[in-house]
């Protein structure tokens, strides 16, 4: 046959288009096994069958067919621990960030049919199996119900539930968003005997009300009990009920530690230690003191006792307790001692082993880096993630400490697996860490693999995104660099996304993408093809993300620098970085912009109003404009209270409105969803009012009935198209 003439590929690759981004053309997949034992897991296949896998026997079969799923339009499932039943979840209806309601059907795997009689009410706010057997706990209309078996009539555990007033087993808005980060507030004991839950009383909390326009003649009003900074907070109580005979004693209240109960406080988390031991974490309203309380069930008293000598206090003298949240304990097999991440004497968050008192804690990890999460503690190993490797704060590697050895030996499980491709991992462990899955998020294409928990040997590739790899072959992707810059005694890590044919001798427009919130991190070694990737690829814009003071995992000195003075250093450090980027020689000083969303919208607004003349234009999406408008738990964690004798002055000084005059010389695009339950539209309304009062011209866009994520497909298309036009106009880029 005729020989092929070899043609060098040349530049046949195309740039990314905005359409690619909006259609999610280059989205990646991850694979998290749904572990059901030491060596077995379930996974939902591409065609929606629920497949059972046994790693050791290599057996796999469909445990629940897609036709059964489809028969009730199920989008999720949950297998009972005795493997006799599966709940099927359908009619998913999102509420806030984590919460949603749904309809649940129980399928009997033995009979191959749905359980009839005493069907679950709808819609249910939360449902879960007990850890043993097939008891069901669920929340309906803010009350908790229990079923001893799926076919049994339910037992009502709580009677106090009332819409927008009292929540049992589910958090109210502020606890869901700012404290628990879950849709649930109930926890089974390991043997399924006890059920712990929280009651949130919001009766005295002020209501945020906003219009939801819908399609009707009249808008409806959404009312949410939402404590803003300094307002009355939810009153929380923790109860435990014996699910064997719940009707006998009824729910038993767990006492709050005296040093916590003496003033306003929060419940922060609950961890079951054993079948009759529970660990509760509490936090003072002024969030620099956290108390971990270990409570035991006293059979003779039929009560939960929390002795004072089982209270462990964690206090920060330089800022707030914990990172974003106070860390949770990982208990040892002895059900007494535990491992926990908190700041060491040098202000770096590290793993400590607590046997009796926090004062006598043994530090397990140390160094000028931070331990981030404890995944699992087994008889002989502790698995955790950190950003230690090669000194890059934006990496995540998984480490194993052999706690059986003295001294404990440390091994990095992931550091050298796929070094170029993978520098940011998370993990998912089977019951006693006999096996685990690693999910790598980048910087290369994400990949999920299965490993032996003893040898760390890779057993199988679960997902390697081959299709994505193939479809990206003909795309001109930008080059991504993660580096650091120094200013005075400070080091700032940044990520720069450079256009495909980047030439240092040329000048490029610069867009700063900022978040900058306390204990956040933007400079991460992760893969992404998103709007800013497109801007670099197609529009030739240099993008930079900078982690300034207040961001996470670089020690408390860096983190707590913003304590009680939000809106100062976060902005200053973005400005410093821009000046450094200009010095690099390839930035067109006349074409620099900044944009951010949420906290990033706050920082971008303040940066634009800094009066430096560095920015030509900028965008703020759903910005906070005053910390008095935001949630109590968040605002007060970092700012204290907006009272005269506390920090009212800085609350007032740090508003966007206070700097309205300074927007005169920049092009400002202000965007907000009118149904934002999180950062209320009020924030942008007040910015707009202040700009109008100051006679400052600006652009604005609202998204009717959209929340903080502006997530609806149509709105998102419009949003990114609109922002693209704005930027291209600002940078004088042809359409």
């Amino acid at each position: 046959r005729p020989s092929r003439v070899y043609k060098p590929e040349g530049n046949t690759k195309r740039a990314l288009t905005l359409k690619d981004i909006l259609n999610g053309t280059f989205s990646y997949k991850t694979y998290f096994p749904n572990w059901i034992s030491e060596q077995e897991y379930l996974h939902q296949s591409e065609d929606d069958n629920i497949v059972f896998y046994n790693i050791e026997t290599r057996e796999s079969y469909i445990i629940l067919s897609n036709s059964t799923m489809k028969s009730v339009n199920a989008t999720d499932y949950g297998l009972s621990p005795d493997r006799q039943f599966v709940y099927l979840e359908s009619d998913y209806s999102k509420l806030w960030r984590y919460s949603y309601t749904a309809t649940y059907y129980i399928y009997d795997l033995q009979n191959g049919e749905f359980v009839r009689g005493y069907e679950l009410p709808r819609p249910i706010q939360y449902l879960c199996w007990s850890p043993v057997g097939s008891k069901l706990a669920y929340v309906y209309q803010n009350n908790i119900y229990l079923k001893q078996r799926p076919g049994d009539p339910p037992f009502q555990i709580t009677y106090t539930g009332r819409e927008n007033r009292i929540f049992n087993g589910i958090p109210d808005w502020v606890y869901e968003e700012e404290m628990l980060a879950t849709k649930y507030a109930l926890w089974w004991s390991p043997d399924g005997k006890f059920l712990a839950y929280v009651e949130f009383n919001d009766s005295d909390i002020p209501i945020i009300a906003y219009s939801y326009y819908g399609d009707g003649q009249y808008p409806r009003t959404i009312n949410i009990p939402y404590p803003k900074a300094g307002a009355k907070n939810p009153v929380v109580r923790v109860f435990i009920v014996d699910t064997t005979y719940p009707h006998h004693v009824g729910p038993m209240e767990v006492p709050v530690p005296e040093m916590i109960a003496s003033s306003d406080y929060y419940f922060s988390w609950l961890t079951w230690v054993s079948s009759e031991r529970v660990c509760l974490q509490w936090l003072k309203r002024v969030q620099n003191v956290s108390v971990l309380s270990i409570c035991d069930f006293r059979e003779d008293w039929h009560a939960w006792e929390c002795p004072k000598n089982q209270e462990h206090v964690e206090e920060s003298r330089t800022g707030w307790a914990g990172g974003f949240f106070v860390s949770t304990p990982a208990f040892s097999q002895d059900a007494t001692s535990y491992y926990k991440i908190f700041s060491d004497k040098d202000g770096y968050k590290h793993i400590h082993y607590i046997k009796d008192t926090v004062e006598n804690a043994i530090q397990i990890t140390s160094g000028k880096w931070e331990a981030i999460y404890i995944f699992r503690v087994t008889q002989d190993s502790l698995f955790y993630s950190s950003n230690e490797f090669e000194g890059y704060p934006g990496r995540r590697n998984i480490y194993r400490i052999s706690i059986g050895n003295s001294p404990p030996s440390k091994k990095c499980v992931t550091c050298h697996l796929r070094k170029e491709r993978c520098q940011y991992y998370t993990a998912s462990f089977s019951y006693k860490a006999k096996y685990y899955a690693l999910v790598c998020y980048g910087p290369g294409l994400p990949i999920s693999t299965l490993h032996d928990g003893r040898t760390d040997q890779e057993i199988q590739v679960l997902e390697e995104n081959k299709e994505l790899e193939n479809s990206l072959r003909n795309i001109q992707l930008p080059k991504v660099e993660i580096k650091k810059l120094k200013d005075g005694g400070l080091t700032f890590w940044y990520k720069m996304i450079l256009p495909p044919q980047f030439d240092r001798s040329k000048k490029y427009p610069l867009l700063i993408q900022v978040y900058g919130g306390p204990c956040s991190q933007s400079v991460k070694s992760v893969f992404a093809v998103n709007w800013i990737t497109y801007l670099a690829s197609k529009e030739g814009i240099v993008i930079a993300l900078v982690d300034g003071r207040g961001t996470a995992f670089q020690g408390d000195k860096f983190l707590h620098a913003v304590y009680r003075k939000l809106g100062v250093y976060e902005v200053e450090d973005q400005l410093t970085a821009v000046r450094k980027f200009i010095e690099m020689g390839f930035i067109d000083e006349e074409r620099i912009a900044i944009w951010g969303w949420s906290y990033g919208g706050y920082v971008s607004s303040l940066a634009l109003a800094s009066g430096t003349g560095l920015f030509k234009c900028g965008i703020a999406v759903a910005p906070v404009s005053s910390w008095e408008y935001y949630a109590s738990i968040y605002s007060e964690r970092f700012m204290g209270l907006p009272t005269k004798d506390d920090n009212l002055e800085h609350y007032k000084n740090s508003t966007v409105m206070a700097r309205a005059e300074y927007f005169r010389n920049v092009d400002y695009l202000l965007i907000h969803g009118t149904a934002d339950d999180n950062v209320h539209f009020q924030n942008s309304a007040q910015i707009a009012k202040a700009l109008v009062n100051a006679q400052v011209d600006f652009q604005a866009m609202w998204y009717s009935d959209q929340n903080h994520g502006i997530l609806s497909g149509r709105s998102q298309n419009h949003l990114y198209t609109h922002m693209t036009h704005f930027l291209k106009q600002c940078f004088s880029l042809s359409d």
């Epitope: 009689g117 005493y118 079923k147 001893q148 078996r149 049994d152 009539p153 037992f155 009502q156 009677y159 106090t160 109580r237 064997t244 005979y245 009707h247 006998h248 004693v249 009824g250 729910p251 038993m252 209240e253 006293r298 003779d300 008293w301 039929h302 009560a303």
Partner: antibody, heavy 117, light 108 residues
Framework: EVQLLESGGGLVQPGGSLRLSCAAS????????MSWVRQAPGKGLEWVSA????????YYADSVKGRFTISRDNSKNTLYLQMNSLRAEDTAVYYC??????????WGQGTLVTVSS | EIVLTQSPGTLSLSPGERATLSCRAS???????LAWYQQKPGQAPRLLIY???SRATGIPDRFSGSGSGTDFTLTISRLEPEDFAVYYC?????????FGQGTKVEIK
């Protein structure tokens, strides 16, 4: 040994009030929900009211809702039932019992309430 | 509310005989929440069975309970003289807790 001792019963006119007490001993009173159960002469048992161990939650039968109030003083190990607007049909022996909704594992000896003009 | 109907209303038996008492619920009750009590004249009720089939402390093994759903049974295998009394079933599944109207076991 668990003991429950009711007191406060007696004769009262319709529309009148009475306060029953139940002194508890032999167990950690504050840990347990407690109930009042009554028995009209020659009739069966009827649950009247219950209160959680901490006293934070109370429950009532429809027949007494709005008229009776259950309370407890954990420092005194005592359960109370305040009965207002009494009617002839409230005539019964009132027992205090240890439990929320059952099983009622310990009962007092009962106190007789007679509502009559 | 759940209505519990006991049958028979009266059971006339001799000591040594077997007594079978029935309790029917107007709607299904999880067995965990069903109890039986014994009451003698002038005395407070005494718990016999909880969880439909578990004997309370100190209750002799001639007393046994069974059943599920809507039908429950209390059985006294061999009646002793002290067993002649009124027996009540009770559900604690749904507020308000309710009692059956009672079955009187009398000496024949």
């Amino acid at each position: 040994e668990v003991q429950l001792l009711e007191s406060g019963g007696g004769l009262v006119q319709p529309g009148g009030s009475l306060r029953l007490s139940c002194a508890a001993s032999g167990f950690t009173f504050s840990s347990y929900a407690m109930s009042w159960v009554r028995q009209a002469p020659g009739k069966g048992l009827e649950w009247v009211s219950a209160i959680s161990g901490s006293g934070g939650s109370t429950y009532y039968a429809d027949s007494v809702k709005g008229r009776f109030t259950i309370s407890r003083d954990n420092s005194k190990n005592t359960l109370y039932l305040q009965m207002n607007s009494l009617r002839a049909e409230d005539t019964a022996v009132y027992y205090c019992a240890k439990a929320w909704m059952g099983p009622f594992d310990y009962w007092g000896q009962g106190t007789l309430v007679t509502v009559s003009s | 509310e759940i209505v519990l109907t006991q049958s028979p209303g009266t059971l006339s038996l001799s000591p040594g005989e077997r007594a079978t008492l029935s309790c029917r619920a107007s709607q299904s009750v999880s067995s965990s929440y069903l109890a039986w009590y014994q009451q003698k004249p002038g005395q407070a009720p005494r718990l016999l069975i909880y969880g439909a089939s578990s004997r309370a402390t100190g209750i002799p093994d001639r007393f046994s309970g069974s059943g599920s759903g809507t039908d429950f049974t209390l059985t006294i295998s061999r009646l002793e003289p002290e067993d002649f009394a009124v027996y009540y079933c009770q559900q604690g599944h749904i507020i308000p807790p309710t009692f059956g109207q009672g079955t009187k076991v009398e000496i024949k």
